[in-house]
Interface confidence: low
Amino acid sequence: VEIYTSRVLEAVNGTDARLKCTFSSFAPVGDALTVTWNFRPLDGGPEQFVFYYHIDPFQPMSGRFKDRVSWDGNPERYDASILLWKLQFDDNGTYTCQVKNPPDVDGVIGEIRLSVVHTVRFSEIHFL
C-alpha cells in the first residue's frame, strides 16, 4: 500500500476541512480494508484517535473529535479521506492516515500538517 497526502493543509477557524488521503494497492479493495486516522497535537501531547473505517465508518464516541468528524472516502476509488468540522485553533497538528489492505504489505503512514488560521489565509497574502 502506498499513501498519498498533501504535505500541509490550511483551514480557517470555525470552518470545515477535508483531510485528503488516497492510496494505491496491488490487492483489490475488499472487506479486509481498514483505515485509521490519528492526531498528534502541535504541542507534542499524546496521540489521539480521530477515525476508523472497516466496512463501515466508526466515529469516536468521546474526546475532542466526537461529533466533529465524518467519513468522506470512497474505498472503490482508493480514497480514505475524512471531513473535520468546526475547526478550532487547538486542532493544529499532524493528522496521520494509515491504510491496511491485506494481503498487500502495510505502507508508509501518510501525514497532513493542519494549520488552523484566522480568517485571512496565507494564500491570499502577496508572496514576498
Epitope: 502506498e2 499513501i3 498519498y4 497526502t5 498533501s6 504535505r7 500541509v8 493543509l9 490550511e10 488516497t22 494505491s24 502541535l42 504541542d43 507534542g44 508508509v108 500538517r113 494549520s115 488560521v117 489565509r121 496565507f122 494564500s123 497574502i125 508572496f127 514576498l128
Partner: antibody, heavy 116, light 106 residues
C-alpha cells in the same frame, strides 16, 4: 506581511561551527514548522530538516543528523540552525522556509563560505 | 530516498513556443510541487499539489502527472519565464528536489 529574515553571508574556518538565524514576522510563529534547505551551485536543493516551534520537536534528513542542530527562540520568533565540523562541502546557501497549502515563504538565504 | 530526475537540464525556447519540462521520480509519489528561481532570488512556489497554480502565477502555466511522471507546461513562452524550475516531492521522507531545468529565451 510574512517575512523570514536571514543574514546575507557568513565566513567560517574549516573545523569550526556556525549558528545561522532566521527571524520570522507577520504570522504566528508557533503555527508552522520551520524548515531548512541547502542549495549548492550545480547540485540542487537538499532538505535538511524541520522544527516545531511550539515544543522544539525536530525531524532531520538522515544525511544531516550529525551535521545540523535546529533550535528556536519563541520569545524572539527566531529559528536557528547550528552546523558543526565545517568543511568545504558545507559551503552553500542555506534557506529557512515555512510551507502552507498554496504558498511557501522563504528567507533570502545565508551564503555560508567555509575557507581558511 | 526518492530521486527526482528533471529533463532536459537546459532548454532554450522562443517567444510563443510551447514548453514542457518533465520530472521523473524513482518511485511513485502522490503529488509534485514546482518552484521557479531566478539568479539572486529565493525560490518561488509555482505549482502546488501537481496542478494548482500558486498565487500570481500566469495562466499559461500548467502542471500535470501522476505516479512517477510529472510535467510543467508553458503554453506560450514569454521572456519573463526564463528561469530555473525545480520539482519537489513530499510523499516520502526526506522531501527531495530535482536538480532543476534551466529555461532560457532563444
Amino acid at each position: 506581511q510574512v517575512q523570514l529574515q536571514q543574514p546575507g553571508a557568513e565566513l567560517v574556518k574549516p573545523g569550526a561551527s556556525v549558528k545561522l538565524s532566521c527571524k520570522a514576522s507577520g504570522y504566528t510563529f508557533t503555527n508552522y514548522w520551520m524548515h531548512w534547505v541547502k542549495l549548492r551551485p550545480g547540485q540542487g536543493f537538499e532538505w535538511i530538516g524541520e522544527i516545531n516551534p511550539t515544543n522544539g520537536g525536530t525531524d532531520y534528513n538522515e544525511k544531516f543528523k550529525r551535521k545540523a542542530t535546529l533550535t528556536v527562540d519563541k520569545s524572539s520568533s527566531t529559528a536557528y540552525m547550528q552546523l558543526s565540523s565545517l568543511t568545504s562541502e558545507d559551503s552553500a546557501v542555506y534557506y529557512c522556509t515555512i510551507y502552507t497549502t498554496a504558498l511557501d515563504y522563504w528567507g533570502q538565504g545565508t551564503t555560508l563560505t567555509v575557507s581558511s | 530516498q526518492i530521486v527526482l530526475t528533471q529533463s532536459p537540464a537546459l532548454m532554450s525556447a522562443s517567444p510563443g513556443e510551447r514548453v514542457t519540462l518533465t520530472c521523473s521520480a524513482s518511485s511513485s509519489v502522490g503529488y509534485m510541487y514546482w518552484y521557479q528561481q531566478k539568479p539572486g532570488s529565493s525560490p518561488k512556489p509555482w505549482i502546488y499539489v501537481t496542478s494548482n497554480l500558486a498565487s500570481g502565477v500566469p495562466a499559461r502555466f500548467s502542471g500535470s502527472g501522476s505516479g512517477t511522471s510529472y510535467s510543467l507546461t508553458i503554453s506560450s513562452m514569454e521572456a519573463e519565464d526564463a528561469a530555473t524550475y525545480y520539482c519537489q516531492q513530499w510523499s516520502s521522507n526526506p522531501p527531495t528536489f530535482g536538480a532543476g531545468t534551466k529555461l532560457e529565451l532563444k
